[in-house]
């Protein structure tokens, strides 16, 4: 399945409303930094690039998630937020149509539900750390600097597979 | 199925590679774990690498034990043998890890390491 | 650490007669439900019996059942065979991967 030019543009202003959203600097956090775990080799290496379209789909269905808590609304101004989630939503249906098309032709017999058990976990332990911080605005902005760099991570491998094939 | 290789006498200290064969699928597909028993004792949890390579080790393993793989077979290199590491080594895989990495359901026969001076 | 405590070490049974074994985690496992068990006799690598808590591996007999949830698990043995003579184990699955881990191992001797 070919993902239309715009998920790739899509992906980019993602990446761009993430660094605009942010509002303290991450320096006068760097105390409450936290390695999450991301498992990053499931998003390209040897796969091909329709193995790795579920696993990405669950990557931005966990960030809709995320970012659509009541927390998250406190801590981020609303008018970015609404357009983040505008593209993510945008990004989740062409995913989505893929994922549908790609439905018998893939040979991967568990739809990487290793890979995607993986991501989910991730998630889970950014969670968790920003319910011990007590979703404080350190906390969030160290959330928010990790989820800009693990999804340009995984868009940026998901691209490099395109251009091989 | 799975199969391990690689077991033998070493000397504490002298690094040791395991290997794990997989016959009549493809290790891109899944996850494979190794688990250790050593003799008389219960069962150990070393790491586990996905399909897409992925690798996480148990706290006791990170930095005593290297998991890689190959499109064929999957590695445990043990970097510092100690004689605590005397144990039968395990190759598993799970078709199920949408229950987590530990529900492993094909396991190779195992391959003895013997750590001693 | 994460810790899976397994009741009993050692458990004996009659030939039709009914085991439970305990798995005591101290946090809860990933999901509530990723705790599997396994069987295991001497000589032979472990055989798979039940995963996500309380679903039955492939080939395995509906005279085992798992139950329990978040920290507590229970392995059930019903209409014990002589067969069945072996170790079980438990093995959690948690958030952070560091911490998956097997519990001790219960023995059950069939009488």
């Known amino acids: 399945c070919d993902l239309p030019q715009t998920h790739s543009l899509g992906s980019r202003r993602t990446l761009m409303l993430l660094a605009q959203m942010r509002r303290i600097s991450l320096f006068s956090c760097l105390k409450d930094r936290h390695d999450f775990g991301f498992p990053q080799e499931e998003f390209g290496n040897q796969f091909q690039k329709a193995e790795t379209i579920p696993v990405l789909h669950e990557m931005i269905q966990q960030i809709f998630n995320l970012f659509s808590t009541k927390d998250s609304s406190a801590a981020w101004d609303e008018t970015l937020l609404d357009k983040f989630y505008t593209e993510l939503y945008q990004q989740l249906n062409d995913l989505e149509a893929c994922v549908i098309q790609g439905v018998g032709v893939t040979e991967t017999p568990l739809m990487k539900e290793d890979s995607i058990l993986a991501v989910r976990k991730y998630f889970q332990r950014i969670t968790l750390y920003l319910k011990e911080k007590k979703y404080s605005p350190c906390a969030w902005e160290v959330v928010r600097a990790e989820i800009m760099r693990s999804f340009s991570l995984s868009t940026n491998l998901q691209e490099s597979l395109r251009s091989k094939e | 199925s799975v199969e391990e290789s690689g077991g033998r006498l070493v000397t504490p200290g002298t690094p040791l590679t395991l290997t794990c064969i997989a016959s009549g699928f493809s290790l891109s597909s899944y996850a494979m774990g190794w688990v250790r028993q050593a003799p008389g004792k219960g069962l150990e949890w070393i790491g586990i690498?996905?399909?897409?390579?992925t690798v996480y080790y148990t706290n006791w393993a990170k930095g005593r034990f290297t998991i890689s793989k190959t499109s064929s077979t999957v590695d445990l290199k043990m970097t510092s043998p100690t004689t605590e590491d005397t144990a039968t080594y395990f190759c598993?895989?799970?078709?199920?890890?949408?229950?987590?990495?530990?529900?492993?359901?094909?396991w190779g026969p195992g391959t003895l390491v013997t750590v001693s001076s | 650490a994460q810790v899976l405590t397994q009741t009993p070490s050692s458990v004996s049974a009659a030939v039709g007669g009914t085991v439970s074994i305990s798995c005591q985690s101290s946090?809860?496992?990933?999901?509530?439900?990723?705790l599997s068990w396994f069987q295991q006799k001497p000589g032979q690598p472990p055989k798979l019996l039940i995963y996500g808590a309380s679903t039955l591996a492939s080939g395995v007999p509906s005279r085992f059942k798992g139950s329990g949830s978040g920290t507590q698990f229970t392995l059930t043995i019903s209409d014990v065979q002589c067969d069945d003579a072996a170790t079980y184990y438990c093995?959690?699955?948690?958030?952070?991967?560091?911490?998956?881990?097997f519990g001790g191992g219960t023995e059950v001797v069939v009488k």
């Open positions: 598993a895989r799970t078709d199920y890890p949408a229950y987590g990495f530990t529900s492993f359901n094909i």
């Open positions: 093995a959690g699955d948690y958030v952070d991967d560091m911490e998956n881990t």
């Open positions: 946090k809860s496992v990933y999901n509530n439900n990723c």
């Open positions: 690498v996905l399909s897409g390579g």
